[in-house]
Amino acid sequence: AGVFELQIHSFGPGPGPGAPRSPCSARLPCRLFFRVCLKPGLSEEAAESPCALGAALSARGPVYTEQPGAPAPDLPLPDGLLQVPFRDAWPGTFSFIIETWREELGDQIGGPAWSLLARVAGRRRLAAGGPWARDIQRAGAWELRFSYRARCEPPAVGTACTRLCRPRSAPSRCGPGLRPCAPLEDECEAPLVCRAGCSPEHGFCEQPGECRCLEGWTGPLCTVPVSTSSCLSPRGPSSATTGCLVPGPGPCDGNPCANGGSCSETPRSFECTCPRGFYGLRCEVSGVTCADGPCFNGGLCVGGADPDSAYICHCPPGFQGSNCEKRVDRCSLQPCRNGGLCLDLGHALRCRCRAGFAGPRCEHDLDDCAGRACANGGTCVEGGGAHRCSCALGFGGRDCRERADPCAARPCAHGGRCYAHFSGLVCACAPGYMGARCEFPVHPDGASALPAAPPGLRPGDPQRYL
């Protein structure tokens, strides 16, 4: 036994053109609710067929009134999970239908009116106890985003919720024929509820109410030891009341049947009975074929050559996954060059380019200097999507229209005085310093820190910065 859980993340307009009109208006406020229907295996998804695995209805969402003129946003959702309990084993493969319903809250005679807004359906493989699986489905112009999982209800565990667990009775080990319950190592596998009086030590059951004997025991309640006087060849589980057997572990240790298959021991080995949707000697092969329509989002289904793969989905651009169920985040590949903004519209990819760039992927660098002039003899330099002027000496600013004050940055070191000059600036150095920016101290013995003073200049003379 266990519970299938569905979490609706959003319901709103899908990507691409033709956004749907909001289902609610000021004149007709409404609220949403959801219905989920589950069927085992890969059954037909006709809405009318019974939901053999179960169905659930969500609570009503908050009342919503459309803002006039605004496009339909993601609509407010009901709180909480939709939970579908299942009594028997989880089948491993299932079909689902999720319906979005609108409850109109106008002044209807006879109470609120309900109408179906969208229906999505699919087939999936899912092991119980696994993580949340995310999904996106589209119905017309609407898009539904949701997650789902199947979890076992204690004491059941396993991918099909067929193994049972209970707290350990002894601190160190589990009882005869019972193993620790991974991942709950502090718990042990628990036997099913067998026939009343069935020996807990020597009997077991694979179906509630039965009592099958471990090797070495017999009788309707497995309380009678098998006689060892006529022992010839120890072999196999006890038949009914006779034979010669040695006690041993319980049935199908380790459950070697995959995907929730049920296991029964044979004298030397075991046999598997597979649930719907699986086959193979150990139920290891999925029985899904192209006839079941397993490929979503327009994926092309072809029969698999591999015996363990009955079909292969070839996904259209923008989708991936074994069933084409996952949308590719095409923007994660950063297709837009030169800092362009990527927009995945579903049907197409768009790049919104920064100024100075163009092209489908912003790959073209526009001529930034076209039609732009730099004043006062400045030259235009392209780059970075915007033009830049390299100004002549004495001028600055974006277009070289501002007269520059070369002394504004205080370029002369060690207290040197700065003079603006037609070719730049000149530093008049304080005593004891020399160099174009007065950066070099003059040694006391008269030698400079420079290898040689430029000809015609003595320390202390103004140094022109060329």
């Epitope: 041993g248 004298p267 030397r268 080995s269 000697l281 150990r282």
Partner: antibody, heavy 116, light 106 residues
Framework: QVQLQQWGAGLLKPSETLSLTCAVF????????WSWIRQPPGKGLEWIGE???????SFNPSLKSRVTISVDTSKNQFSLKLSSVTAADTAVYYC??????????WGQGTLVTVSS | DIQMTQSPSTLSASVGDRVTITCRAS??????LAWYQQKPGKAPKLLIY???SLESGVPSRFSGSGSGTEFTLTISSLQPDDFATYYC????????FGQGTKVEIK
């Protein structure tokens, strides 16, 4: 006592298809599992695959793209085909019967040599 | 795939010796393990199934034990007919054989 008799071509060229058949004498064909196992000269045993009377198969994952095992219940026979053979497929091939995964009755073995 | 590792690969022993061969599985196989004996030029012969059950007609000096990932085959008193190669085989998931242990005369 069930006996298994096997036959098939013993010398193949690379890229050809190996084909072996195993006939079952003196026992019921239903309810059992029918296996093929091979043993390269001087090496250990390698399980190839098995089939039950209903025709459901299970294969060694490393060989399954090349293996076909089929059963003919009307003749009490089952067969192995291994496509695109290479020298690495040179081995003694055994057919066997038993329960799932556990052959307890073996054929005499057929040496198959792959050589150009 | 489940890998099976046997040790030792060769074992020298004398008639009357107690011989133990170990087989280790790369993951738990519960009790789904068999032991085979093979003599040169012959097909293998099943000795033990379900880790510890003796196949009909096999002498009682052969015994098997273990579960999960560690298994042993024991020959309590080696006889001249027991010099052969022994293989373990798991059948929990598909089937895989160990690489074999050759028991030879010391």
């Amino acid at each position: 006592q069930v006996q298994l008799q096997q036959w098939g071509a013993g010398l193949l060229k690379p890229s050809e298809t190996l084909s072996l058949t195993c006939a079952v004498f003196g026992g019921s064909f239903s309810g059992d599992y029918w296996s093929w196992i091979r043993q390269p000269p001087g090496k250990g045993l390698e399980w190839i695959g098995e089939i039950n009377h209903s025709g459901i198969t299970s294969f060694n994952p490393s060989l399954k793209s090349r293996v076909t095992i089929s059963v003919d219940t009307s003749k009490n026979q089952f067969s192995l085909k291994l496509s695109s053979v290479t020298a690495a497929d040179t081995a003694v091939y055994y057919c066997a019967r038993g329960e799932l995964g556990i052959p307890d009755n073996w054929g005499q073995g057929t040496l198959v040599t792959v050589s150009s | 795939d489940i890998q099976m590792t046997q040790s030792p690969s060769t074992l020298s022993a004398s008639v009357g010796d107690r011989v133990t061969i170990t087989c280790r599985a790369s993951q738990s196989i519960s009790r789904w393990l068999a032991w085979y004996q093979q003599k040169p030029g012959k097909a293998p012969k099943l000795l033990i199934y379900k880790a510890s059950s003796l196949e009909s007609g096999v002498p009682s000096r052969f015994s098997g034990s273990g579960s999960g990932t560690e298994f042993t085959l024991t020959i309590s008193s080696l006889q001249p007919d027991d010099f052969a190669t022994y293989y373990c085989q798991q059948y929990n998931s598909y089937s895989t054989f160990g690489q074999g242990t050759k028991v030879e005369i010391k």
